[in-house]
Interface confidence: low
């Protein structure tokens, strides 16, 4: 039975040209995290593999930095970065846990970070 839950940074906003940290945290399970994938819609951004370390997709390597922890830092944000991001925790023996973050990149200089929330 899958007992874990994923906490994420939730719905967040940031300024165009700035940077943002996407973070997820898996709790309430003793399952071993083997790999974490970060995806934007259907595009792979990065992989953090327990054995092999980080891999950043070539098309994002200039704007994506690994960490902190299992999180991901997006830099030089553009309005086109607005959208859904997913952290996909591959664990054993539980299987896959998925967290969702919605990022809005604003032209305005006023960009408030959303509160953390737990996915039901």
């Amino acid at each position: 039975m899958m007992t874990g839950t994923i906490e994420t940074t939730g719905n967040i906003s940031a300024e165009k040209g700035g940077s943002i940290i996407l973070q997820c945290h898996l709790s309430s399970t003793t399952a071993q995290v083997t790999q974490v994938n970060w995806e934007q819609q259907d595009q792979l951004l990065a992989i953090c593999n327990a054995d092999l370390g980080w891999h950043i997709s070539p098309s994002f390597k200039d704007r994506v930095a690994p960490g902190p922890g299992l999180g991901l830092t997006l830099q030089s944000l553009t309005v086109n970065d607005t959208g859904e991001y997913f952290c996909i925790y591959h664990t054993y023996p539980d299987g896959t846990y998925t967290g969702r973050i919605f990022l809005e990149v604003l032209e305005s200089s006023v960009a408030e970070h959303g509160a953390r929330f737990q996915i039901p």
């Epitope: 899958m2 896959t96 039901p120």
Partner: nanobody, 120 residues
Framework: EVQLVESGGGLVQPGGSLRLSCAAS????????MGWFRQAPGKEREFVAT????????FYADSVKGRFTISADNSKNTAYLQMNSLKPEDTAVYYC?????????????WGQGTLVTVSS
């Protein structure tokens, strides 16, 4: 709501191959990950493999790594499990499972299962 229907099970000799299919219908846009579990007679259901919506993230149980391959065809809304070098201990009912984007993990939706028997 999402419905999952498995097919492709049957009787195969040790060392043989089978390909299972899991066809998704309904609110398929809400699916984020799909995977396979199995349950042998008298045993608990165990995780086999999983694949993320984009197809770039896959993970396997140690017992099937190198022998089984999970894949997905988004145009057909179908996930596949190619099983090679089958062993008698692979005999089980194989279940397809899926998770929603906002889910905590695989197992939101289950298929009815398809029986795989490996015997000479």
């Amino acid at each position: 709501e999402v419905q999952l229907v498995e097919s492709g099970g049957g009787l195969v000799q040790p060392g043989g191959s089978l390909r299972l299919s899991c066809a998704a219908s309904g609110s398929i846009s809400s699916i984020h990950a799909m995977g396979w579990f199995r349950q042998a007679p008298g045993k608990e259901r165990e995780f086999v493999a999983t694949i993320s919506r984009s197809g770039v993230g896959t993970f396997y149980a140690d017992s099937v790594k190198g022998r089984f391959t999970i894949s997905a065809d988004n145009s057909k809304n179908t996930a596949y499990l190619q099983m090679n070098s089958l062993k008698p201990e692979d005999t089980a009912v194989y279940y397809c499972a899926s998770s929603y984007s906002s889910s905590s993990g695989l197992g939101d939706i289950w298929g009815q299962g398809t029986l795989v028997t490996v015997s000479s």
